[in-house]
């Protein structure tokens, strides 16, 4: 039985050209995390954090994605096309997979604020 919960940064906004941290946190489970996958709205993989092998950033995102902090991901040089859903998938033993969702809105406005409140989706 899966007892854990994923907390995410929820719905966030950031300004064009800026950067944003995508963060998920798994709690309330004894399961061991063996891998975390980060996917974009079109299901393309941005990055994988593997317990043994460390981080792998996919080539299409190498210039704009930085690993961390922790198991999170930092998106840089944001464009309007980055607006959309992002998913973290935790592979855990023996629970299985936990999935969290973040919605990022990239704003033209220079007064866009990056909200970083945590919420359970």
């Amino acid at each position: 039985m899966m007892t854990g919960t994923i907390e995410t940064t929820g719905n966030i906004s950031a300004k064009k050209g800026g950067s944003v941290i995508l963060q998920c946190h798994l709690s309330s489970t004894m399961a061991q995390v063996t891998q975390v996958n980060w996917e974009q709205h079109d299901h393309s993989l941005l990055a994988i954090r593997n317990a043994e092998l460390g981080w792998h950033i996919y080539p299409a995102f190498k210039d704009r994605v930085a690993p961390g902090p922790g198991l999170g991901l930092t998106l840089q040089s944001l464009t309007m096309n980055d607006t959309g859903e992002y998913f973290c998938t935790y592979h855990t033993y023996p629970d299985g997979t936990y999935r969290g969702r973040i919605f990022l809105e990239v704003l033209e406005s220079s007064v866009a604020e990056h909200s970083a409140r945590f919420q359970i989706p």
Partner: antibody, heavy 122, light 106 residues
Amino acid sequence: QMQLVQSGSELKKPGASVKVSCKASGYTFTSYPMNWVRQAPGQGLEWMGWINTNTGNPTYAQGFTGRFVFSLDTSVSTAYLQISSLKAEDTAVYYCARTGGYSVDEYSFDIWGQGTTVTVSS
Amino acid sequence: DIQLTQSPSFLSASVGDRVTITCRASQGISSYLAWYQQKPGKAPKLLIYAASTLQSGVPSRFSGSGSGTEFTLTISSLQPEDFATYYCHQTIFRPTFGGGTKVEIK
């Protein structure tokens, strides 16, 4: 190469305790969960539970709570199984086994120790 | 807990035979199933994981198939070293093993 090496056979009297060790080498010990599996004489494999090698938190399968304790010493990449108040029915081969694979569909016990025979007899 | 039922429990076969072992799960487990071979006095050895993926170094005469609740391990042409006991194993939630299938020489 990657391997798990267990401590040697044990002959114990009922009521005694035993501690079996499982030393890992050739890989990062804390990256993979560790399991314990029991095989009674002439019987099949029975999953006893597992220990999170990151946190040290153990999880015990039904029937293996109370007298069974899983622990770790990550400084020497070793997992331990301790059984207290031994009974004749604890006579078995005990295996440690690593959960290999990174994504859930890859999980399997890919590396096993050679097994430790524990005999409980008066 | 999820129960795994293997059949048959015993199987007599000859070198060169095609051998099939079945494993049924009490509820759906997707493809979260592994197969192991165990010889007397030895630790189990991983043959197949993810229901059908051959572990590195395992001969190609071994194959696995199935998903959900029904799985099979097939040995296409039994070799002398294949006489052993085979176990299926569901690998997530609370892992469990099947009861084993002993493959003996006919």
